[in-house]
């Protein structure tokens, strides 16, 4: 019963998490104009992974997609890739976990097969969650770097020749949605892996044999043979994304004004 509950809860938590990852990926508020300590403007800028938007105080909102692929910063592309990989893995994990649910009967599927599928989906959820957390964290790091760069520009007069107001960007709602969603997917994946242990047959179905020795009798019950899942080597979390070494210039190449069009 506890195994079914753990598996079911893991599935629901992961489902919510993946829905959150999808929502975060689609959201436009990955970065929002920093309003603190700035002149009060009647225009508010915010950006997502796919387009940038401007909301005027009049209520008029205009969004422009990043119609170029090659012109986009490598870090933004990496974040997009991580989020998409997270969604794809999560979606596959959900599909697998539906068939693995103990409460759903599909033909004469053995418990060992369900255990395998539960573990597979669990690992997929874990990797999916890690991808989302990594993607959001990379973007957040990018924002922090650009924030301090633009702050330096504001106070050292580096932007003297530039005709635009130095717009600083801070964390948008999508980052928090992404972090929470990634965490939920991760937790759901761990719960699925825990449920897998309970689903795996603990004992073989051999009849116990009694050996009668002189004086007293001792019954030996062969058991404790755990069904091999074949996933032993994969239970350690592999490093999914390695950003590689970046020069200071490369890291800062993400434009603070995010004008990709």
């Amino acid at each position: 019963m506890a195994v079914t509950a753990c598996q079911g809860l893991g599935f629901v938590v992961s489902l919510i998490g993946i829905a959150g990852i999808i929502a975060a990926t689609c959201m436009d508020q990955w970065s929002t104009q920093d309003l603190y300590n700035n002149p009060v403007t009647a225009v508010f800028n915010y950006q997502g992974l796919w387009r940038s938007c401007v909301r005027e105080s009049s209520g008029f909102t205009e969004c422009r997609g990043y119609f170029t692929l090659l012109g986009l910063p490598a870090m933004l592309q990496a974040v997009r890739a991580l989020m998409i990989v997270g969604i794809v893995l999560g979606a596959i994990g959900l599909l697998v976990s539906i068939f693995a649910l103990k409460c759903i009967r599909i033909g004469s599927m053995e418990d060992s097969a369900k255990a395998n599928m539960t573990l597979t989906s669990g690992i997929m959820f874990i990797v999916s969650g890690l991808c989302a957390i990594a993607g959001v964290s990379v973007f957040a790091n990018m924002l922090v770097t650009n924030f301090w760069m633009s702050t330096a520009n504001m106070y050292t007069g580096m932007g003297g020749m530039v005709q635009t107001v130095q717009t600083r960007y801070t964390f948008g709602a999508a980052l928090f949605v992404g972090w929470v969603a990634g965490g939920l997917t991760l937790i759901g994946g761990v719960m699925m892996c825990i449920a897998c242990r309970g689903l795996a047959p603990e004992e073989t179905n051999y009849k116990a044999v009694s050996y009668h020795a002189s004086g007293h009798s001792v019954a030996y019950k062969p058991g404790g043979f755990k069904a091999s899942t074949g996933f032993g080597s994969n239970t350690k979390n592999k490093k999914i994304y390695d950003g590689g070494a970046r020069t200071e210039d490369e890291v800062q190449s993400y434009p603070s004004k995010h004008d990709y069009v």
């Epitope: 104009q33 002149p39 009060v40 403007t41 009647a42 225009v43 800028n45 950006q47 940038s52 938007c53 401007v54 005027e56 105080s57 009049s58 209520g59 008029f60 205009e62 422009r64 005709q163 635009t164 107001v165 717009t167 004004k257 995010h258 004008d259």
Partner: antibody
Framework: QVQLVQSGAEVKKPGSSVKVSCKAS????????IDWVRQAPGQGLEWMGG????????VYNEKFQGRVTLTADKSSMTAYMELSSLRSEDTAVYFC???????????WGQGTLVTVSS | DIVMTQSPDSLAVSLGERATINCKSS????????????LTWYQQKPGQPPKLLIY???TRESGVPDRFSGSGSGKDFTLTISSLQAEDVAVYYC?????????FGGGTKVEIK
Amino acid sequence: QVQLVQSGAEVKKPGSSVKVSCKASGYTFTNYLIDWVRQAPGQGLEWMGGINPGSGDTVYNEKFQGRVTLTADKSSMTAYMELSSLRSEDTAVYFCARRVRGNSFDSWGQGTLVTVSS
Amino acid sequence: DIVMTQSPDSLAVSLGERATINCKSSQSLLNSGNQKNYLTWYQQKPGQPPKLLIYWASTRESGVPDRFSGSGSGKDFTLTISSLQAEDVAVYYCQNNYFYPLTFGGGTKVEIK
């Protein structure tokens, strides 16, 4: 068509208050901000503040902060501007205007002349 | 507050001639997010409320004759009346629509020479 109709001219004593109304028609009142601009005789235009009739959110010119109050009544599609502690220099024509894209004002009321005189 | 400086204060132009009004902002009105300049031009005739001519520095409001055009970016803007007509006699104002408080220029009076 979009129309903003303002209340009639007012003569007030220094230190008193005046409340000017602006009745909107021809559009969805809650979808657009209403701004108030004043113009002293023979002078230029001066923005006083704006209100979102849908939410009631307001933004004021600091010059008038504490003296001006903007309100809106959704049911009657009417915006109000109240200016208190009137002084002789508050003698002006007060306009209401609808804010549209570009944060520009596309439709204006006919103006209300407020004369502050002892 | 953003200071909007218009020049000249008054302008006398012959009918059919070009009239040019300048507007200078104390800060850039160009928004990096959409590369639009938040500057508006209005025309005001005596005893009337202002009339919107141009927004986003160069976008003509519907119904405004095409002899009116706006140009400029950042801090410097221009309103041009390519061929002055008798009905164009008015005071023209530029407005900062980017920073609060929204501020207007002092106005330029256009007359017929």
